[in-house]
C-alpha cells in the first residue's frame, strides 16, 4: 500500500520486507501535536501539555472478531474514536509489594513519571513522524549489519517477560549507523495492538500500524547497559512496522510458532538462532532517524532511533497470533502494549532520503521544510 | 558498575530448606527494578537450567522440578531477589546463579548449594 504521492521507487523485494515507501507525504495536519489516529484517549498533546507524558489511559479494547482485518494506509487520514468500553488491558495489576511504584504497565496506575522521572523528560519516544517535515540528511548512509545471521545453535532465549516477547540476542551481532557510530545488538522484541487495533509504537501522519519491531543496540564505546543509559547515542533501536501481507512471513514464524510455549508471563523458551536480519526491511538506505528515548520506564533519553521506511510484511493470521496468543500481569492479555505518541518538543527527525519533497503535479516546485544538521559531517 | 551478588548457599540434608539472596549493588542500580529476576542453576556436567524468574510486575514462573517447593520473591526498595527452597533434594545439588534481564543479561557469581546426607 502507498499514500497519496509516493515517490516512485520500485519495491527491492527479498527477505521479510514490504513496500518500499510505506511513509509518504499526506496533507499536514495545522497543529504540529494534534490528535493522531488510534493513539490512547487522553494523549492527544493539547497545546499546554506538551511536557505530560500523559501514560494514565489506554485504548480499551473492542470485541474481538475473527482476522478482523488492520487499518489501510489509503484509509488515511482518519482519527478514530475510542473502542467501545470494555475492561482495558493490563489493569489487574499484580502489586505484591503494596504501594511499589516499579511495577509499570500501559494504561492506569502508577503513571510512569512516578515510576521513573525520566518518563517526563522533553524528548521522549514514540513520536509521530511526518515526512514532509523531515530533514533530508544525505550524511546519513546505508546501516550496516554484521553476524546477524545466526548459526542454529546456539539456541535463543525467547521470554515473554510481561510486557513484550523478547529475543536475547547472543555476542556478535554488529550495527553501525555510520563511520564511527557502532552498537552491538541486545536483544529484539515486539509492539503490538488487539483484534482490529492496531499497536505500533511510532506512528506515521497519525497512521498506526499494526506492530513493531525494536532491535536494541548498545554502543561499543560501553560495556554494558547500565553506563550508556541516557547517554546521548549509548542506545540505539532499528525499528520496522509491520503490515499485513497475504503470504507467511517465515523469518517471523520461527518466533511466532513458538509463541503458546510461552504464553504465561515470565515463561522462556528456546529457539534455533535465525537470521534476525530477516525480520527487518531490506533496504536499509532509506530511514528516518531522531533522539528520543527508551519507550517503557525508565524511558532514558539519549537513545538514538532509526525508523525503516520500508515495511515487513506478516499474513493476518500472524499479525492475529502475534497479538492473541500472550498474557500478562494479572491474567489479562498481553495486548496494545504501545506507548503514546509523545511530542518533539522542537526535535527534527532526519530522513536518509528526501522523504519530504513533494514530486507530485500538484506542487510547483519541492518544499523541504526543515535542514539537515549533518549535513557537514 | 552494576554487580549481582548471591548469598545463603551451603550443605543441606535432604528435606531441608535454604533461602538464597541475591543482592544489586552500583551507581545504577535502580535499573534492576524493571528487569526480570531469575535463577539458575548449573549441576555438574549439565547445561544451566532455568528455575524461577519473577517479572518487573511481580508475575512469577518456576520450572516443573520445583513447582510447589520454591519461591522466588522481590524486594525492589532493598534491590534483592530471594528464593526460598524448601523440601530440598538431592538433585537440587548446583550452583544457583542470579540473573536480571534488562536489555542485556547481568550474572552473579554463583552460589553453591549441596543437598546431601
Known amino acids: 500500500q502507498r499514500l497519496p504521492r509516493m515517490q516512485e521507487d520500485s519495491p527491492l523485494g527479498g527477505g521479510s520486507s514490504g513496500e518500499d515507501d510505506p511513509l509518504g507525504e499526506e496533507d499536514l495536519p495545522s497543529e504540529e501535536d494534534s490528535p493522531r489516529e488510534e493513539d490512547p484517549p487522553g494523549e492527544e498533546d493539547l497545546p499546554g501539555e506538551e511536557d505530560l507524558p500523559g501514560e494514565e489511559d489506554l485504548p480499551e479494547v473492542k470485541p474481538k472478531s475473527e482476522e478482523e482485518g488492520s487499518l489501510k494506509l489509503e484509509d488515511l487520514p482518519t482519527v478514530e474514536a475510542p473502542g467501545d468500553p470494555q475492561e482495558p488491558q493490563n489493569n489487574a495489576h499484580r502489586d505484591k509489594e503494596g504501594d511499589d511504584q516499579s511495577h509499570w504497565r500501559y494504561g492506569g496506575d502508577p503513571p510512569w513519571p512516578r515510576v521513573s522521572p525520566a518518563c517526563a523528560g522533553r524528548f521522549q519516544s514514540p513520536v509521530d513522524i511526518r515526512p514532509q517535515l523531515a530533514a533530508f540528511c544525505p550524511a546519513l548512509r546505508p546501516l550496516e549489519l554484521l553476524g546477524f545471521q545466526l548459526p542454529p545453535l546456539p539456541e535463543l532465549r525467547l521470554r515473554n517477560n510481561g510486557h513484550s516477547v523478547q529475543l536475547t540476542l547472543p555476542p556478535g551481532l554488529e550495527m553501525a549507523l555510520g563511520p564511527g557510530r557502532e552498537y552491538r545488538a541486545l536483544q529484539l522484541h515486539l509492539h503490538w495492538g488487539a483484534a482490529g487495533r492496531p499497536g505500533s509504537e511510532h506512528t506515521v501522519e497519525g497512521h498506526r500500524f499494526p506492530a513493531e519491531i525494536h532491535v536494541v543496540h548498545l554502543s561499543t564505546a560501553f560495556a554494558r547497559v547500565d553506563e550508556a543509559l541516557g547517554r546521548p547515542g549509548g542506545l540505539a533501536v532499528l525499528a520496522a512496522f509491520l503490515e499485513e501481507g497475504p503470504e507467511e512471513n517465515s523469518a517471523y514464524e520461527q518466533l511466532l510458532s513458538r509463541l503458546e510455549e510461552i504464553a504465561e508471563e515470565g515463561s522462556e523458551t528456546q529457539v534455533p538462532g535465525l537470521d534476525i536480519s530477516a525480520l527487518l526491511p531490506s533496504d536499509f538506505s532509506r530511514y528516518f532517524q531522531y533522539e528520543g528515548s527508551l519507550t517503557t520506564p525508565p524511558c532514558a533519553q539519549g537513545v538514538i532511533w532509526t525508523v525503516f521506511n520500508q515495511t515487513v510484511m506478516l499474513s493476518a493470521k500472524q499479525l492475529h497470533t502475534l497479538s492473541d496468543t500472550l498474557w500478562g500481569p494479572g491474567d489479562s492479555r498481553l495486548q496494545l502494549n504501545f506507548r503514546a505518541t509523545q511530542p518533539l518538543n522542537g526535535r527534527v527527525i532526519e530522513a536518509s532520503f528526501p522523504a519530504g519533497v513533494d514530486s507530485s503535479p500538484r506542487a510547483a516546485e519541492p518544499v523541504q521544510l526543515n535542514s539537515c544538521l549533518a549535513a557537514g559531517d | 558498575q552494576v554487580q549481582l551478588q548471591e548469598s545463603g548457599g551451603g550443605l543441606v540434608q535432604p528435606g531441608g530448606s535454604l533461602r538464597l539472596s541475591c543482592a544489586a549493588s552500583?551507581?545504577?542500580?535502580?535499573?534492576?527494578?524493571?528487569?526480570?529476576m531469575a535463577w539458575y542453576r548449573q549441576a555438574p556436567g549439565k547445561q544451566r537450567e532455568l528455575v524461577a524468574v519473577i517479572t518487573s510486575a511481580g508475575g512469577t514462573k518456576y520450572s516443573d522440578s520445583v513447582k510447589g517447593r520454591f519461591t522466588i520473591s522481590r524486594d525492589n526498595a532493598k534491590n534483592t531477589v530471594l528464593l526460598q527452597m524448601n523440601s530440598l533434594k538431592p538433585e537440587d545439588t548446583a550452583v544457583y546463579y542470579c540473573?536480571?534481564?534488562?536489555?542485556?543479561?547481568?550474572w552473579g557469581q554463583g552460589t553453591q548449594v549441596t543437598v546431601s546426607s
Open positions: 540473573n536480571a534481564d534488562y536489555l542485556q543479561d547481568y
Open positions: 552500583g551507581n545504577s542500580v535502580n535499573i534492576f527494578r524493571f528487569a526480570a
